[in-house]
């Protein structure tokens, strides 16, 4: 149904409190190096605008499309050029290339601090003084270093954010109650933002199609008893309500969320039995509870997949007949039966399907050459398990540390070209995956790593495109969205590096070091342990093992002496030397 | 959307010949390997031949071999059978799948086989 005034229809939806929310995020994810003041002036002009169109949708303006209006009102930036330079040269540009322009100078990296958070006494008393502008800064401060957080969650976990202070602030030990409320949001919320940037990358990079596939898998395993049909149905809202927020069109985002989580309550008897407690929660966290809901449990006496995919003489026909709604098909009949995969390995099967019956559909047999499909897909289910298995395996004997470490060596290897703050970023990233998914069950093991995986993955894809420097990173990369993962775990020792030459600053060390709290000392020492392996590639584990054993005894040797820094000063060239004659 | 028309069917005596062919259209014909199914009168379906996507493969039921040949034209998107030496028994409702299929999805053609 078309609306006279967009901007007065999403106003009178989502009603003021979400509108401005929402208004704040569009503008802190395209604008942000602005100060949070600025982005209030605008909110509070937006807002106002968008009233004087719910009384009069005729009145001036107001039936532009949101984005047309967002794109004034931020060419209408005096300081717009002198803050954001070439951003500024989008003004010149007419709707939708203007939109498109936007987008692409969104910062995944912006040179912003880290969002500290200040001491619970301050955090309370800014809070009590007007928590709807520390609300407010909350979600400038999120989306200025997330510009493609999920908007519609950004509220869910500002609301979050909001009810932890209320309750914490009267508590007599407000550190003790805040912290591990804030801890548990603050993960979650980075989570959420992963999770999203990838559903944007998937759509931006490869497509609708690619999109549409994930959706499907996911939801077949979390909806096991609903129809394929009905997979479909809210698959195609998922897309539509997706693409806007990566788009930037919140307000519709944000809307049609709450449009489809409303779809799903009234059609939750064909969708799953645990969509009842979902459904009596308000807006938002209705929205998150389906977004994050326990899978329901599988039908009993599903039939074999083969009956269907393999022993059908239609098989080719079908295929032939409506491509993607057949493997659509097939990849919500193997979803549904396996909850325990992750999302890429189902993909992966599909694709493995798909390319079976390319190939066997044009020979004069079919159903001879397609017979072992099965058998022949078995490989993309052994080696994640296998690699699940081994890496698990490692992470239980070395600890948390320990395994980053030997992540360290394994992707240097793999890059060296990669710069080392970013290799430290990513083997600590990736040693995380051991300790959030290694204790789960065998079933939840491989699912929690991959789908994990991809996100971390996802996130070098993306600073590695905006800087890139090796060319296997960037064919990883971009080959195949759901061969990612497969793709780097392939990757060796580059042969084409050329080592680095030895830099003895690169290794030496001061009694600053011994102060630095735990996580700050081993990322230095993980620093030291990448250049290490650019200046030796091809280093054996035992000559490696040596040289951090050698390594750890100085630092603790120094940093327990009486003379800290006479000991760095005395002992490193000594420890340097050692180093290069063991790796020699 | 998938169409097979079936054409060339009709009345011949023992021993005549006849040349079906079957235009298809809505998918990638060349990407598809093709086959003939027949059925007779208050009978089964029954395979008769298959031809790869290039048309460098073909199989034939026991009952045809030496006799019928398959063939297709994938610039015209069009499989034929050439039907020599008919017998009686080959009188059925002749129809083009795709793949192993055995069902029909089109109108097929007769083939009347008597003297």
């Known amino acids: 149904e078309a609306h006279k005034s967009e901007i007065a229809h999403r106003f009178n939806d989502l009603g003021e409190g979400h509108f401005k929310g929402l208004v704040l995020i569009t503008l802190s994810q395209h604008l942000q190096k602005s100060p949070f003041e600025e982005h209030v002036k605008l909110v509070n002009e937006v807002t106002d605008f968008a009233k004087a169109c719910v009384a009069d949708e005729s009145a001036q303006n107001c039936g532009k499309a949101i984005a047309t209006l967002f794109g004034d009102k931020v060419c209408a930036i005096p300081s717009l050029r002198e803050t954001y330079g070439e951003l500024a040269d989008c003004c010149a540009k007419e709707d939708p290339d203007r939109v498109e322009c936007f987008l692409q100078h969104k910062d995944d990296n912006p040179n912003l601090p880290p969002f500290e958070r200040p001491e619970p006494e301050a955090l309370c008393t800014a809070f009590k003084e007007n928590n709807d502008r520390f609300i407010g800064h909350y979600l400038y401060e999120v989306s200025r270093r997330h510009p493609y957080f999920y908007a519609p969650e950004l509220l869910y976990y500002a609301e979050k954010y909001k009810n932890a202070l209320t309750e914490c602030c009267e508590a007599a030990d407000k550190a003790a109650c805040l912290t591990p409320k804030l801890d548990a949001i603050k993960e979650k919320a980075l989570v959420s933002s992963a999770q999203q940037r990838l559903k944007c990358a998937s759509l931006q990079k490869f497509g609708e199609r690619a999109f549409k596939a994930w959706s499907v898998a996911r939801l077949s395993q979390k909806f096991p008893k609903a129809e394929f049909a009905e997979i479909s149905t809210i698959v195609t809202s998922l897309t539509k309500v997706t693409k806007e927020c990566c788009h930037g069109d919140l307000l519709e985002c944000a809307d049609d969320r709450q449009e489809l989580a409303k779809y799903m309550c009234e059609h939750q008897d064909s969708i799953s039995s645990k969509l009842k407690e979902c459904c009596v929660k308000p807006t938002l966290q209705k929205a998150h509870c389906i977004l994050e809901i326990q899978r329901d449990e599988l039908p009993t006496e599903l039939p074999d997949l083969a009956v269907d995919f393999v022993e059908d003489k239609e098989v080719c026909k079908n295929f032939a007949e409506a491509k993607d709604v057949f493997l659509g098909t097939f990849l919500y009949e193997y979803s549904r039966r396996h909850p325990e995969y992750s999302i890429g390995m189902l993909l992966r099967i599909a694709k493995g399907y798909e390319a079976k019956l390319e190939k066997c559909c044009a020979e004069a047999d079919p159903h001879a050459c397609y017979a072992k499909v099965f058998d022949e897909l078995q490989p993309l289910i052994d080696e994640p398990k296998k690699l699940v298995q081994q890496n698990c395996e490692l992470f239980d004997k070395l600890g948390e540390y320990g395994f980053q470490n030997a992540l360290a060596v394994r992707y240097t290897q793999k890059a060296p070209q990669v710069s080392t703050p970013t290799l430290v970023e990513y083997a600590r990233k990736l040693g995380s995956v051991g300790t959030k998914c290694c204790s789960l069950p065998e079933t939840e093991r491989l699912s929690c790593t991959e789908n994990y995986l991809a996100l971390i993955l996802n996130r070098l894809c993306i600073l590695h495109e905006k800087t890139p420097v090796s060319e296997r990173v960037t064919k990883c990369c971009t080959e195949s969205l759901v061969n990612r993962r497969p793709c780097f775990s392939a990757l060796h020792v580059d042969e084409t590096y050329v080592p680095k030459p030895f830099h003895a600053d690169s290794f030496t060390f001061h009694a600053d070091i011994c102060t630095l709290p735990e996580k700050e000392k081993q990322v230095k020492k993980q620093m030291a342990l990448v250049e290490l392996v650019k200046h030796k590639p091809k280093a054996s584990e035992e000559q490696m093992k040596t040289v951090m054993g050698d390594f750890a005894a100085f630092l603790k040797k120094c940093c327990d002496a009486d003379n800290k820094e006479a000991c760095f000063t005395e002992d490193g060239p000594k420890l340097v030397a050692k180093c290069q004659a063991t790796l020699a | 959307e998938v169409q097979l028309v079936e054409s060339g069917g009709g009345v011949v005596q023992p021993g005549g010949s006849l040349r079906l062919s079957c235009a298809a259209s809505?998918?990638?014909?060349?990407?598809?390997?093709m086959s003939w199914v027949r059925q007779a009168p208050g009978k089964g379906p029954e395979w008769v031949s298959s031809i790869s996507g290039s048309g460098s493969d073909t199989l034939y039921a026991d009952s045809v071999k030496g006799r019928f040949t398959i063939s297709r034209d994938n610039s015209k998107n069009t499989l034929y059978l050439q039907m020599n030496s008919l017998r009686p028994e080959d009188t059925a409702l002749y129809y083009c799948?795709?793949?192993?299929?055995?069902?029909?999805s089109s109108q097929g053609t007769l083939v009347t086989v008597s003297s």
């Open positions: 809505g998918f990638t014909f060349r990407s598809f390997g």
């Open positions: 799948t795709i793949g192993g299929s055995l069902s029909r």
